[in-house]
Every structure is written in C-alpha cells, then in structure tokens.
C-alpha cells in the first residue's frame, strides 16, 4: 500500500467537468400533421468521453417505458468526444393530444442518468388567420420583389409554411420564427422572393400554412396581380 | 502529518463544475445610432459561488486597457448563487468602427481568468430598404388590422424599428427578429395592430427605422388609407 | 415538348364577332400564364392581355378592353380568345404565347403558337 | 403606356458584317427588355431576356447590352439565316409594348 494511501481520484478536464448533456427535441411541425409523414422525437448526447463511450436510452411515453427507438451509431466530434442520437417514432394523435416524451441517458462517465422529459406546449390550441400581401408599389421599381404571408393568432407555436406558384412549389422564401403576441398567441411572416415580370404577368402565388387548429391541419392562401382587380 | 498525506481536493459540486460563467452583450443598435443616448457593453458573470464571491473586471478597447467601467453590487440568484455585472460606456463611433471590447473576469473560483471579446459583425454594411403594406382586405373584417412594415436587404443585422402616428409613438407593435436572406443580408417584418376604425379614418401610421447604413442613421416610411390610392 | 396549338383562319364580315382557339399540350396546362398578341400585316406586335388558367385570373391592356375576352378550358388543355364588333382595323394574326420560368430565368413569351389569321372583309 | 423607339426601320448589310440595333424607352425599363426574331410569315423567336442573357440554342453571335432607356442587341458577324424582322419588347411594366420593328434583309 502506499505511503500515502489511496490516491486522489482526478475530477474531470475542465472542459468536461459536466460530463454528457442531453437534448431533447419535437418533432418537425410539418410532420405532426401529415399522415403520409412520420413523426420523431430526438435524443441527442453530446460531449460523451472517449474513456466511456456506452450510451443508454431508455424511452417513456405517459410514464410507461416503450421499446420502439433507433439508436444511431455514435459520430465523433473535432473535440474527440462522441456524439449520440436516439430516435423514437411518435403516433401523430399521441403529440398531438400532450403525450409527455420522455428519454433517460445513462452513461458512466454521468454521477447518475439524466431524464429529458419534452411535449407539445401546453394549453388551447387557437387557428391561424393567413393574410397575403402584395409589394409595395415602391418595390415595384425593383427586379425582385416581396410577396408577404402573414400568420397570425395561432398556438401551439408549431406551424410549417410553403410556397408555390400556378400549384409547383416555389423554393424562394424565408420565414420568420413565431412572435409572441400580446394575447399569448404567437404571429409570423413568410416572405417569398420573386422576379418582377412573374408577379407582373399574373401567376397567381399561394402561402401554404399547416398547424393542428386548421381543418384539416391545412390552409391556402393566394395572391395575385389580376386577384381583386 | 496525516497517515495519508494532505486530504484530496474536493470535486466542485456538480451543479457547478464548470465554475462561473461570463456573458458579453453588445449595445442596443438604437443607443449607438443616436447620439443623445449611451451605448454600453455589458458583462455579466453568473454561477459565482458564495465561497468566492469577489469577481475582479478588466477592459480592454482594441487591446488597450480602460478604467471606465461600472461594476454593479452583485446579486444573490434563487440557486444560492450570485450574479455580477459591469457596464462599459462605449464611443458611438469607436463601436460603429468595429472596434473590439474585452472583459477579463477574474475570480477565485476558476482556474484562470475567462476573456471575452466582443465588435460590430464584420463586413460591408448594406442599407435597409423599408416598405409599408397595408392591411389585407380579408383582415378589415375584423375589429383590429395589421399594419406591416418590411425591412430588408440590411447588414449588419443590428437595426431599431419604431412605429408613430401623426408624431405620436405607438406602443402596440411586436418586431421579428432579423433573418438571414440568401444574399447575407437581413431582412424582418415589424407589425403594428391598431382599431380598425382608426385606419378607416385615414390617420397617418409611420414606420420609423434606424439603421447604421442609413443617411443620418434614419429613415421613415408612411401608411394610411388615403396614402397612394 | 411544348407546343401551342392554334386554330386555322377566319373570314368574318364586319360587325360579326369570332372565337379562336389554342390548345396546349408537353407541359400542365394550369402551370403558366397564356398572353395574346396582334400583328397587322407589316407591322409590330401588340399585347391583348394574358388569362392564367390556374385561377381564370384575367388582365387587359386597356387598348383591347371590351374588344377581346379571354377565357379557357382546364378539361382540355385550351385557350380561347374571343374578338367582338370586328372592323377591318382587327384584321391581323392573332398569337397565343406562354413564358418559360426555370430557377432564376424567366423568359416572357418564350413559346409561340403558329398564329390565327383574322380577315375581317363585307 | 412605355414608348420603344427601335430603330433602324430597314437595314441592308453584308454577310458576315457586325450588326447593331437599337431600341430607346421613354422611360428607365429595369433591364426588363426581350429581342425576338420573326421570319416571314412564322412566329416570333425569343433571343434575348433581361437585356443580356441569351436564350438557350441561339447562336452566340447574337448579344444584347443596355440599361435605363437604351438598349441594343448586336450580331457580331452576320450570316444569312439572320434575315428577318427583330423586334424588342419593354416588360418592366404592364402593358407589355413592342418596339416597331427592324427589318433586316441582306445586301
């Protein structure tokens, strides 16, 4: 034995003295809706060490462990530690109804498992009212010009929007993450960017907008040069 | 001498084995753009144990060491912890020019010192095109109509937007936060919400934007019902 | 492949009105917009107007309103231009045309059908 | 409405002479400017959009430059499948408007 007894056991690199984290994320809004489209729930680790590198998942819906994840191979990082991903296919109705998700990552380099509990956000679900709006007139003296889709009074925050054109999709846009409104409802703007001589000859461009509240999780709206003319 | 030599150094406790944290935020776009108002950098330092609470600040403007900050009384957070703050007054011009401002922080409770530096985004700035829309006709079926003003094509992507009507602030309006386009610029939406009736009456509603790229900082557009029809 | 079919010439009196025809096919017919044009014997082409057969979405040049009505038929992939109160001053080659729109080119009137003649003679 | 002024009417070159014609607006059009070719008794052919980007399969002889109010498109070296009436076309604001026309015949 030595001198000195048993020797100090080493607290972590600093750069590691958390050890693993977890994040847990809801599936694409998109995908809660569709019935053509699956559904998942995602349980990533990051800054697992190379020393313990065995990751693992144990998954709960309500409280009552399920047996249905795929655990992705683990993927190494720049900074020598291993990332991990776990994902767990989800009904559509179960998100959609408040299902609570649960992922519990055990892992030796953790002083105990780390449980990540995510659902959709709770309260009443409100519908979206859709607004297009048509360039100013004095971006009219642009070559591109700013279709606008306003999306307001809707929650959960949730929501998927898309573009297209005579009914071919159209790839050109950006939208803004939901605002919170002063009512609790949440608001955004989808902006679809377009050559002038398309709007001006009259191809008549519709925002898509998918989300729970709607009938049939789907509305459309449309806008036009000749609309309302 | 103790059999066993000196005691082992105890682990942080896991709450915060990382130690403190240090946070460094810019001006708000609004105070370096108006000369009458004080921008200021301002780092903050949270998880500081009650072990060692004394935190020691350091600045540095491109390098060079300043002595004009202000280091607040630190306070006591819900987990035991403290939080601290110092507050640099910076030059509108210095911050405009991209000059780069450091805080070292100091404290017992971490190994070494943490530095954080901070500037204006890199780059060309690129000077915001402001459009207003009116409401949508659908919308004016409601008691409340949106009023739109879009900002885009800005870099960088500090920017203030501000609503008045006929020369008095209105309140009741939610920005979105900036959003990367596919050229590098920016662009957002700002929306005002207003009674139906007061659009209806032809009252005057202005967009008022601030933006390092604009002539004078500022530029302002209109919107009523009577506005170009 | 694209093509535009139109319909064959016409000898109207004056006064009388006449429908002409053109029919689409190698793309979806309800994906672009249909534009028509005139052009008198030796002289240049003017714009009538366009109709969008997604939405029956129409637009004139103010020169041709009341003269032409646009219309067209989903079911068969048709266009239709109907030219009322004819006089003499009518009498030309009528085009459809369509804009071609991939990425970031639009080309505007980019296909062409063969032309309608139109001789309006008592 | 927008006034295309193109001009030459008539012209009468040579084979393999560079040529140029010209089209004026009465007012800044945005590059928003076509050249088509139309041979007798057919129907016009798209060369030119946005002023300087050729059409996909016409020849590269054929070019267009301009901005504001003035256009031009040029064929660098003529050769005689180019005969025939050119016209330009201003679409940066509704109504579309034609320029009158070039007639180009070979000496």
């Known amino acids: 034995e030595s001198k000195y007894g048993p020797p100090c056991p080493s607290c972590p690199a600093p750069e590691f003295l958390g050890g693993p984290s977890v994040f847990l994320f809801p599936p694409k809004p998109k995908d809660t809706l569709m019935i053509s489209r699956t559904p998942e729930v995602t349980c990533v680790v990051v800054d697992v060490s190379q020393e313990d590198p065995e990751v693992q998942f144990n998954w709960y819906v309500d409280g009552v462990e399920v047996h249905n994840a795929k655990t992705k191979p683990r993927e190494e990082q720049f900074n020598s530690t291993y990332r991990v991903v776990s994902v767990l296919t989800v009904l559509h109705q179960d998100w959609l109804n408040g299902k609570e998700y649960k992922c519990k990552v055990s892992n030796k380099g953790l002083p105990s498992s780390i449980e990540k509990t995510i659902s959709k956000a709770k309260g009443q679900p409100r519908e979206p009212q859709v607004y297009t709006l048509p360039p100013s007139q004095e971006e009219m003296t642009k070559n591109q010009v700013s279709l606008t889709c306003l999306v307001k009074g809707f929650y959960p925050s949730d929501i998927a929007v898309e573009w297209e054109s005579n009914g071919q999709p159209e790839n050109n846009y950006k939208t803004t993450p939901p605002v919170l409104d002063s009512d609790g409802s949440f608001f955004l703007y989808s902006r679809l960017t377009v050559d002038k001589s398309r709007w001006q000859e009259g191809n008549v461009f519709s925002c898509s907008v998918m989300h729970e509240a709607l009938h049939n999780h789907y509305t459309q709206k449309s806008l036009s040069l000749s609309l309302g003319k | 001498e103790s059999k066993y030599g000196p005691p082992c150094p105890s682990c942080p406790a896991p709450e915060f084995l990382g130690g403190p944290s240090v946070f460094l935020f810019p001006p708000k776009p609004k105070d370096t753009l108006m000369i009458s108002r004080t921008p200021e950098v301002t780092c903050v330092v949270v998880d500081v144990s009650q072990e060692d609470p004394e935190v020691q600040f350091n600045w540095y403007v491109d390098g060079v060491e300043v002595h004009n900050a202000k280091t607040k009384p630190r306070e006591e957070q819900f987990n035991s912890t403290y939080r601290v703050v110092s507050v640099l007054t910076v030059l509108h011009q210095d911050w405009l020019n991209g000059k780069e401002y450091k805080c070292k922080v100091s404290n017992k409770g971490l190994p070494s010192s943490i530095e954080k530096t901070i500037s204006k985004a890199k780059g060309q700035p690129r000077e915001p095109q402001v459009y207003t829309l009116p409401p949508s006709q659908e919308e004016m079926t409601k008691n409340q109509v949106s009023l739109t003003c879009l900002v885009k094509g800005f870099y960088p992507s500090d920017i203030a937007v501000e609503w008045e009507s006929n020369g008095q602030p209105e309140n009741n309006y939610k920005t979105t936060p900036p959003v990367l386009d596919s050229d590098g610029s920016f662009f957002l939406y700002s929306r005002l919400t207003v009674d139906k009736s007061r659009w209806q009456e032809g009252n005057v509603f202005s967009c008022s934007v601030m933006h390092e790229a604009l002539h004078n900082h500022y530029t302002q557009k209109s919107l009523s019902l009577s506005l170009g029809k | 492949e694209v093509q535009l079919q139109q319909s064959g010439p016409e000898l109207v009196k004056p006064g009388a009105s006449v429908k002409m025809s053109c029919k689409a096919s190698g793309y979806t017919f309800t994906s672009s917009v249909m534009h028509w044009m005139k052009q008198k014997p030796g002289q240049g082409l003017e714009w009538i107007g366009y109709i969008n057969p997604y939405n029956d979405g129409t637009r004139y040049n103010e020169k041709f309103q009341g003269k032409a009505t646009l219309t067209s038929d989903k079911s068969s992939n048709t266009a239709y231009m109907e030219l009322s109160s004819l006089t003499s001053e009518d009498s030309a080659v009528y085009y459809c045309t369509r804009s071609f729109y991939y990425g970031n080119s639009h080309v505007l009137f980019a296909y062409w059908g063969q032309g309608t003649l139109v001789t309006v003679s008592a | 409405d927008i006034k295309m002024t193109q001009s030459p009417s008539s012209i009468y070159p040579s084979l393999g002479e560079r040529v140029t014609i010209t089209c004026k607006a009465s007012?800044?059009?945005?590059?928003?400017l076509s050249w088509f070719q139309q041979k007798p008794g057919k129907s016009p052919k798209t060369l030119i959009y946005r002023a300087n980007r050729l059409v996909d399969g016409v020849p590269s002889r054929f070019s267009g430059s301009g901005s504001g109010q003035d256009y031009s498109l040029t064929i660098s070296s003529l050769e005689y499948e180019d005969m025939g009436i050119y016209h330009c076309?201003?679409?940066?604001?509704?109504?579309?408007?034609f320029g009158g026309g070039t007639t180009l015949e070979i000496k």
């Open positions: 007012q800044d059009i945005n590059s928003y």
């Open positions: 076309l201003q679409y940066d604001e509704l109504p579309y408007t």
